[in-house]
Each structure stands twice: as structure tokens, then as C-alpha cells.
């Protein structure tokens, strides 16, 4: 048994006569043999669920669900209740109605076995019938909505009449009907004005019925019509077995370059027309088990269940359904030497499904794990300016397919043929497993005998110690010009184009800072700033070279404070700035301020 609503509303007036009928509550059956029996909770409740008093005023007919006044609620009774309402004006009280034999404790009132009946209290007597508007004669102030379980026996779930109005204003004729399309499963009995289902409902065919209730009032010669929405929601039960969309029960996958723990190797989708169990229960009741195979497979893979609500079309309306994605996921980083082929089976069980048929599916994953071999091109050729400053990025080395790698830890090293010409360094980028070449020793760069630098690049897989090697030839170009000691160490200090371009700074490949002119569009990623190289700084990302010294690119790497209009970077730096952004790395501060109009360059442009 279950209530067709979780809440009911009616009005109560002072000194309303004992015996006045108030409203009907309705229960629907889960099984044909069930017979509803209603009982009232013992207490009246007020604002914020305050227990006000034992209910001495309202009774219920246990078999019909009719609530009526047992005794009149006079002023003194009302004041007694108001005093107990924690000082709030008592505008609404409510009662709990339980379905027997459901043995719910009085404290809890949860649908489906309990409903609340709210009474709006008016500190006046019942108004004259002639003063009541048609809307007040027809429907309660709060619009009802109904919940009906699918596949359950048909039954009565609503009664249209406002009983106190019918009782106190017998001369006013009120008629009701439901506006509904042909073939809908509801009927309104013209005599009793009871609304019932004609047959059991199927949520998978239709989930919501947006009906309209029409009320016609006859008072003397006057006839008025009032319409209100009459929504019915069909509640789901687990009556659909899981299926494979388009019959696809097998997925094939190749594990090669993406070998990182938590990588999704393959996905299979399961469709279920139901939306139960609810999300909190779903993973516990809708189980997936990787069937025992070899130990290696059990340790290497896991299955992740990702349910998602979707909507599908049924009979011209959309109803909710569930798609379950089952992802085969790497449980650990795979060594580049692993080389296996296997078939994995996953058992999916919709444990709440009662049939007909089975709620069990078998998913198949065909997985090939391929080994990865490390290869470098035979030779790299690069050039570097003699004026390049320390930490200037001059190029990249990368084993074949390194951009596609994940979960493969490759470290790059440089071995110099001439000890006194060991100018460059290399660091491995976590983003793409490449090695970034940078200037590490500017003094060596200036030595005349270091005009050509010869290195061996060695790439080593940390897990297996497998290696690849390549020659690196670096040509040192240009002549050295002594850096002015007064120039800031960081290009980012300079606030104007002229002072930016007359100095170098850490990370500058040319020995001169570069000015990036912004787009001037408010707080923008493209703010004006001075940079060692606009290719790498700022780009919204503090790369592995820039992390070595805050003076290289504080715009991307600063963890300190940013003053002025800006959007902070995640997790550091300036994501977007207003006007021109300059930084003082030693003070751990950046400033984003409007463009400085006094720049002589602006005068040139204006001319």
C-alpha cells in the first residue's frame, strides 16, 4: 500500500462545527488483495516541526480515509496551540497519516507509508458562501501532484470535492472533469468525483501525465469555469533487464603508449530502461565483477561502473532511462616491456530485477598490451645565440611518440664531449615526456673554443632502464655583448616596451627580453607584459624549466600576491590580467595595471 500523495492541504476556521468533513486521503494497492486502513498520528505539529499538542480535534475514518472535525477548534484551543509554537505566529499546522499495518514510528513520516495533512488556519469563522471566489470553491490553494507506481493494480487516487465547501454551501453546484487525450489511463467518475486509474501504468511508456482539471461552478444563474494543472508522475520499479545497445557486447583495445594507472582502456555500454535503483544504492545493487582470469590480469585491470541518466523517446514523449558505462581501467602503470594479449569477461548483475528473463549480462574485453621501444632520431642539430641567458629554452628532444606517452617515465641526460663546453642542460617535461634543452652555463657559451658543442642525448626508461641515444650538435652563433648589470634579472620587471627590449633577463634565448602587446580587452589572457621568450612565457603554464627560478617567468609561476585586475592561474601565476602585468619576483608580487600611455612608442604609433 502507498499514498498517492505525500502531502494534502485544507483550510481550518475558528469554531467550525464538529462533524465537518475536511478531506479524503487515498491509498493505492501494491497487490490486488491489499485493503487500506488509515490511522492518524497522535500529535499536531507547527512551524519547524514543533510538536504542539495531542490531536484532540481531527479524526479519520479508518476504512475510507475521510478526515473530519471531531470537535470544534475554538479561540482558546487555538491560543493554547499558538503558545507552544516557539513564538512564531501559528499559520499552519499539520498531522501525520499512516497506512496500517505499516508500523512507522510517530517521529518519521516518509512516503510511501505516511503522508502529511496541512491545515491553513484562519482566525475567523467560515466565510459566507456568496463571498467565496470560484477558485476557492473548486480547488485547494496548493495544487496537488500525484505519484503512482508502475505495474500496480488500478485504483482511486483522488477525490475532487472540497468537502467543507460542499458541507457548508450545499446550494452551490460544483462539477469536475479531466481534460485528457484519448486513451489515457484515467477517469473521473461523474457522481463521486473520484479520479482513478483504468489500468496498471507502465513508466517505460510514459512517465509524466500533465492533465488539466476543469471545475464548473453554478451559483444561481452564474456559471464559471476554473482550470488547474493535474500532474501525475509514474514511479519506477526494476522491471527492465539490462541490454546491450545495438547488441555490442565486446570491446577491443590496444594498450601501447598510454600505460598510466587510471587510463581507460575500453568502454562497453549497457542500457537499462529503468531509473532504479536510485543513485545512492545503484553501485551496491547493480554490480559488476571482473571474472577470475590469470593473476596478472586481475592485478592490472579493474572495472569502473559509471551510470548516467538519459532520456529515450517512447510513444511520443520522453522518459528517463539509465546507461551504464563499464570502463576497463589500468590498475597500475605498465612497464614498456609488457607484451600480452588476453580476453577479460565482466559479469553485470541488476540484482533488483525480478524477471521475466535474467538481469545478468556478460561483457567481453579483448585487450592487447604491446611493448614500446625507445627510439631517438640519429642526430639533432640546433643553434644557440652567444647572448642567450641562463635557462633560455633552445629546443626539445623527444623519443619517438613521446607526446603520446603517459605512465612512461623517460629521463633525458646530456653527455658532453668537452668538459669545458658543457653549456646546456636538459629537463624532462612531465606534460609530454620530452626533454627541454636549456642554457645552463653562460660562461661556457662565451668561450671562443665552444663554437660547436657536441653532446650525446641519452633517453632512459626509469622502470626498465632501457635506453636510446642520439647525437646533438649545437652551433653557437653571434658575438657576446656584455649584459648591463643594472638590467633586472627578470624580464617581467619591465613595465614598458622600451625598457623591456633594451635589457635581457633569465630565460632569454636572444639575450634580449621580448615585449608582448596585449589585446586591451579588459581582464584578458593576452595581457601586455615583458617576457624572455613569448613562445614559452607567459603561456598559462609554469613549465619544468621555468620552475627552476622564479625570475624566469613569474607571470606563469609566481605563488605570491597579484595586485590589480586579474584572474589567478591554477595553481599559480596570472591566468588573465588587466592592461600591463609586471612582476617583482624577489618581493613575490605582480601588478596588473592599465596600459601606461606615456610610452614614447605610443607617440610613434599615434603619429
Amino acid at each position: 500500500l502507498y499514498f498517492s500523495r505525500d502531502a494534502y492541504w485544507e483550510k481550518l476556521y475558528v469554531d467550525q462545527a464538529a462533524g465537518t468533513p475536511l478531506l479524503y486521503v487515498h491509498a493505492l494497492r501494491d497487490a490486488p488483495e491489499e485493503v487500506p486502513s488509515f490511522r492518524l498520528g497522535q500529535h499536531l505539529y507547527g512551524t519547524y516541526r514543533t510538536r504542539l499538542h495531542e490531536n484532540n480535534w481531527i479524526c479519520i475514518q479508518e476504512d475510507t480515509g475521510l478526515l473530519y472535525l471531531n470537535r470544534s477548534l475554538d479561540h482558546s484551543s487555538w491560543e493554547k496551540l499558538s503558545v507552544r509554537n516557539r513564538g512564531f505566529p501559528l499559520l499552519t499546522v499539520y498531522l501525520k497519516v499512516f497506512l496500517s499495518p505499516t508500523s512507522l514510528r510517530e517521529g518519521e513520516c516518509q512516503w510511501p507509508g505516511c503522508a502529511r495533512v496541512y491545515f491553513s488556519f484562519f482566525n475567523t469563522s467560515f466565510p459566507a458562501c456568496s463571498s467565496l471566489k470560484p477558485r476557492e470553491l473548486c480547488f485547494p490553494e496548493t495544487r496537488p501532484s500525484f505519484r503512482i507506481r508502475e505495474n500496480r493494480p488500478p485504483g482511486t487516487f483522488h477525490q475532487f470535492r472540497l468537502l467543507p465547501v460542499q458541507f457548508l454551501c450545499p446550494n452551490i453546484s460544483v462539477a469536475y472533469r479531466l481534460l485528457e487525450g484519448e486513451g489515457l489511463p484515467f477517469r473521473c467518475a461523474p457522481d463521486s468525483l473520484e479520479v482513478s486509474t483504468r489500468w496498471a501504468l507502465d513508466r517505460e511508456q510514459r512517465e509524466k501525465y500533465e492533465l488539466v482539471a476543469v471545475c464548473t461552478v453554478h451559483a444561481g444563474a452564474r456559471e464559471e469555469v476554473v482550470m488547474v494543472p493535474f500532474p501525475v508522475t509514474v514511479y519506477d520499479e526494476d522491471d527492465s533487464a539490462p541490454t546491450f545497445p545495438a547488441g555490442v557486447d565486446t570491446a577491443s583495445a590496444v594498450v601501447e603508449f598510454k600505460r598510466k594507472e587510471d587510463t581507460v582502456v575500453a568502454t562497453l555500454r549497457v542500457f537499462d530502461a529503468d531509473v532504479v535503483p536510485a543513485s545512492g544504492e545503484l553501485v551496491r545493487r547493480y554490480t559488476s565483477t571482473l571474472l577470475p582470469g590469470d593473476t596478472w590480469a586481475q592485478q592490472t585491470f579493474r572495472v569502473e561502473h559509471w551510470p548516467n541518466e538519459t532520456s529515450v523517446q517512447a510513444n511520443g514523449s520522453f522518459v528517463r532511462a539509465t546507461v551504464h558505462d563499464y570502463r576497463l581501467v589500468l590498475n597500475r602503470n605498465l612497464s614498456i616491456s609488457e607484451n600480452r594479449t588476453m580476453q577479460l569477461a565482466v559479469l553485470v548483475n541488476d540484482s533488483d530485477f525480478q524477471g521475466p528473463g535474467a538481469g545478468v549480462l556478460l561483457l567481453h574485453f579483448n585487450v592487447s598490451v604491446l611493448p614500446v621501444s625507445l627510439h631517438l632520431p640519429s642526430t639533432y642539430s640546433l643553434s644557440v645565440s652567444r647572448r642567450a641567458r641562463r635557462f633560455a629554452q633552445i629546443g626539445k628532444v623527444c623519443v619517438e611518440n613521446c607526446q603520446a606517452f603517459s605512465g612512461i617515465n623517460v629521463q633525458y641526460k646530456l653527455h658532453s664531449s668537452g668538459a669545458n663546453c658543457s653549456t646546456l642542460g636538459v629537463v624532462t617535461s612531465a606534460e609530454d615526456t620530452s626533454g627541454i634543452l636549456f642554457v645552463n652555463d653562460t660562461k661556457a657559451l662565451r668561450r671562443p673554443k665552444c663554437a660547436e658543442l657536441h653532446y650525446m642525448v641519452v633517453a632512459t626508461d626509469q622502470q626498465t632502464s632501457r635506453q636510446a641515444q642520439a647525437q646533438l650538435l649545437v652551433t653557437v652563433e653571434g658575438s657576446y655583448v656584455a649584459e648591463e648589470a643594472g638590467c633586472p634579472l627578470s624580464c617581467a620587471v619591465s613595465k614598458r616596451r622600451l625598457e623591456c627590449e633594451e635589457c635581457g633577463g633569465l630565460g632569454s634565448p636572444t639575450g634580449r627580453c621580448e615585449w608582448r602587446q596585449g589585446d586591451g580587452k579588459g581582464i584578458t589572457r593576452n595581457f601586455s607584459t615583458c617576457s624572455p621568450s613569448t613562445k614559452t612565457c607567459p603561456d598559462g603554464h609554469c613549465d619544468v624549466v621555468e620552475t627552476q627560478d622564479i625570475n624566469i617567468c613569474p607571470q606563469d609561476c609566481l605563488r605570491g600576491s597579484i595586485v590589480g585586475g586579474h584572474e589567478p592561474g591554477e595553481p599559480r601565476g596570472i591566468k588573465a590580467g588587466y592592461g600591463t602585468c609586471n612582476c617583482f619576483p624577489e618581493e613575490e608580487k605582480c601588478f596588473c595595471e592599465p596600459e601606461d600611455i606615456q610610452d614614447p612608442l605610443c607617440d610613434e604609433l599615434c603619429r
Epitope: E484, A485, G486, P488, V493, E502, D549, F584, E586, E588
Partner: antibody, heavy 119, light 107 residues
Amino acid sequence: QVQLVESGGGVVQPGRSLRLSCAASGFTFSNYGMVWVRQAPGKGLEWVAFIWYDGSDKYYVDAVKGRFTISRDNSKNTLYLQMNSLRAEDTAVYFCARSGPSRHVFDIWGQGTMVTVSS
Amino acid sequence: DIQMTQSPSTLSASVGDRVTITCRASQSISSWLAWYQQKPGKAPKLLIYKASSLESGVPSRFSGSGSGTEFTLTISSLQPDDFATYYCQQYNSYSYTFGQGTKLEIK
């Protein structure tokens, strides 16, 4: 507040050694270059040595090259000047000062410590 | 090394006077010049950097100008607290050098 305090000065015989220390507080010491500047009695200021914020580069005035060594311990917020083979002309008040890499000027100074080289 | 020469060596002036001290570099130092003030028994104090930028907290009566090899420090209206010795210093190269100083005394 931002502060530099020198210590280690005193009277020493020619040819002997002395180590000066400069304790920094109130700022991120490891972000700043540091210098030693000296002032002989009744004379002007003379720059002695400079060290980068990370210790990677050091510069000295010709008169002390090969005899003095500037160093720093960023974990202790302390700057040092190791003075070997001291001469009478090294007698002076020795100041340590902060040099921000953004400006390279000496914006914060200690109160100085007196070194007297005399037999 | 770059030599820095200040003139005059001594300057006598009265409260309220406008005074100018000159500093000359032996070769171009762009704008990489600072001015310091020192009082007897005290550490020097930075007044001006990059030839004309006023250090924060320094009164606006102090100003600097010049570039290349010729630089000046101007005090627009002398105050009693301004009588001290003033040094210029170049930082164009890592052999930082100071001028010999200008002593500003009360007339």
C-alpha cells in the same frame, strides 16, 4: 621589520683571517642578491663583493680578489665574508646590504661592523 | 673599471636653498645610477635609483636626472635633516663603483 645585522668584526694582525656574518630578517633572503661595502675611516664607500640570490655568481673588487670569499646560507638567512691575508688597507667599517635582482641597488643596509688590521 | 667623479667635494648651503650635486661616469652607464645619503656613524640610505626614480619613503624634494655619463642630484629646498654626505654609484657593470662623495654642510 626588514633588518640586516653584521657581526664578526674586531682587531686582527696583518696576514690573519676574519669571518664576517650578516643575519637577515623580515624578507625572503633567498630571493635577493647581497653585497659587502666598506668604508675606511674618514673615506668614501667602496664596494667589496657581490653574490647572487642563489649563490651561482660572485663578483669582487680587484683589491680583494683571491683573498676574500663571499658566501651565503639561505637556510640560515645569513651572508658571510671570509677575509684571508688581511692588510692594513682593509681596515674599515664593513656594511652588508641587500640588492634586489629587479633593481640591483642597495636598498637595505646593516649598521656596519668595524674591522681593524694592525700589528 | 668605470670611474665615478662627483663635484663639488664640499658644498655649503642654507636651509631653503636649492642645491645640485653632479656625478660624471668615465664611460656611458645608460641610466644605471643610484644616489645615497650618509650621516656620520650611520649606514648609507638609498635616495634615487635608475638615475631618476625616487625610492619609496624619500621626500619629493629630492630628484635625479641624466643619462649616459652626466648625472645630477637636486634638492629643491634644503631642510635641516638634509645636511649629510651624498654618494653616487654606478651599477652598469658588476664592478659597482661609488663616487668619492659630496659633503653638504651648513653655511
